[in-house]
Interface confidence: medium
């Protein structure tokens, strides 16, 4: 709304940089062939680029990426009882970000 | 996969807490009747609850919320020229989080 301007602070742009985000570990990252298991932990923290750039034609993108393998528990249910195994999930952390020009494909004439 | 376990660190759960997120300021937050304008900044930082809980039947939810009005620029295009106005957008910050029981509705028999 256009009202109550007095108490409002000027909005500050969320700059393009890495921030901590929560990544949900989906089961198909571990085993696509079997649904009879659980994963623990269900979510982990990752570093991801986010924010806005000063120009409409650029987007905040990762300029440097690192892959980080982590061990999770794969809790298989065998005859109604759990079997705990380790599985490795590779997470993607963004180390640096930049405002990158977005190339919009021109329509074919 | 279950391979290459040696180099992987045990995954740490992303605990239920407030984290900094990027909120996109959509134009309809400012004016639903008119699309002929731009907003600056296009995004801001907010505090939001995220993460996972130790229990299957609970979810990470905000237990304390604060509304924060901020001033943005509404850049109207009038006769192909920009007219700068102020507008207020009210952001929602999460101040505290808790793992809250999710009541799953039982099927009607």
């Amino acid at each position: 709304s256009l009202g109550s301007l007095a108490a409002a602070e000027p909005a500050v742009i969320a700059e393009c940089k890495t921030r901590t985000e929560v990544f949900q570990i989906s089961r198909n990252l571990i085993d696509r062939t079997n649904a009879n298991f659980l994963v623990w932990p269900p979510c982990v923290e990752v570093q991801r680029c986010s924010g806005c750039c000063n120009n409409r034609n650029v987007q905040c993108r990762a300029s440097q990426v690192q892959m980080r393998p982590v061990q999770v528990r794969k809790i298989e249910i065998v005859r109604k009882k759990p079997v705990f195994k380790k599985a490795t999930v590779t997470l993607e952390d963004h180390l640096a970000c930049k405002c990158e020009t977005v190339v919009t494909p021109r329509p074919v004439t | 996969s279950l391979g290459s376990l040696a180099a992987a660190e045990p995954a740490v759960i992303a605990e239920c807490k407030t984290r900094t997120e990027v909120f996109q300021i959509s134009r309809n937050l400012i004016d639903r009747t008119n699309a002929n304008f731009l907003v600056w900044p296009p995004c801001v930082e907010v505090q939001r609850c995220s993460g996972c809980c130790n229990n299957r039947n609970v979810q990470c939810r905000a237990s304390q919320v604060q509304m924060r009005p901020v001033q943005v620029r509404k850049i109207e295009i009038v006769r192909k020229k920009p007219v700068f106005k102020k507008a207020t957008v009210t952001l929602e910050d999460h101040l505290a989080c808790k793992c809250e029981t999710v009541v799953t509705p039982r099927p009607v028999t």
């Epitope: 759990p82 079997v83 705990f84 380790k86 | 376990l5 130790n54």
Partner: antibody
Amino acid sequence: EVQLLQSGGGLVKPGGSLRLSCAASGFTFSSYAMSWVRQAPGKGLEWVSYISDDGSLKYYADSVKGRFTISRDNSKNTLYLQMNSLRAEDTAVYYCARHPYWYGGQLDLWGQGTLVTVSS
Amino acid sequence: SYELTQPPSVSVSPGQTASITCSGDSLGSYFVHWYQQKPGQSPVLVIYDDSKRPSGIPERFSGSNSGNTATLTISGTQAMDEADYYCSAFTHNSDVFGGGTKLTVLG
């Protein structure tokens, strides 16, 4: 204070029964899986039984299967171990312990232990 | 049934490094936890998930696990570290404990 307070141990004759209790305080009991672990005099630790946060999953060591029953009352923040058909080899200090997750995991909090002696 | 094997005893001089091993078939495929127990006391968790240290546990305690062997390492061992140590792993629907290792701090 986060703690587990045990009670119910004592002397019992072979073939007899006993019920151990473990009262939890200082944390949300209903969010944690629990286990019973025992230790015979001068011996090592032996896992006895496990129960999930909501009581839906229960597991037992082969040595106690069919004789011991684990249960919990989340409204009373209490864990139980009903021990029937007791044998001399069940003589041990029994510990209740907390798992940090609903499915189990490490035992991050232990009770003070209670001695069960099976003897005629 | 699954078995975890530990040496019955390990001796170390104060300030030296103590290593306690725990072996089992494909143990590296499971998460291993370590417990310390002093005479007349309840066990205390010192390492979980192979290598994580609970809050309040000194940094001199560390752990590793690969292949068939998990190891608890105590660097700069102190007299107060003298205790029984048990490894544990949750395998096929049961928590299995090793037989325990008595750590003696000499002197």
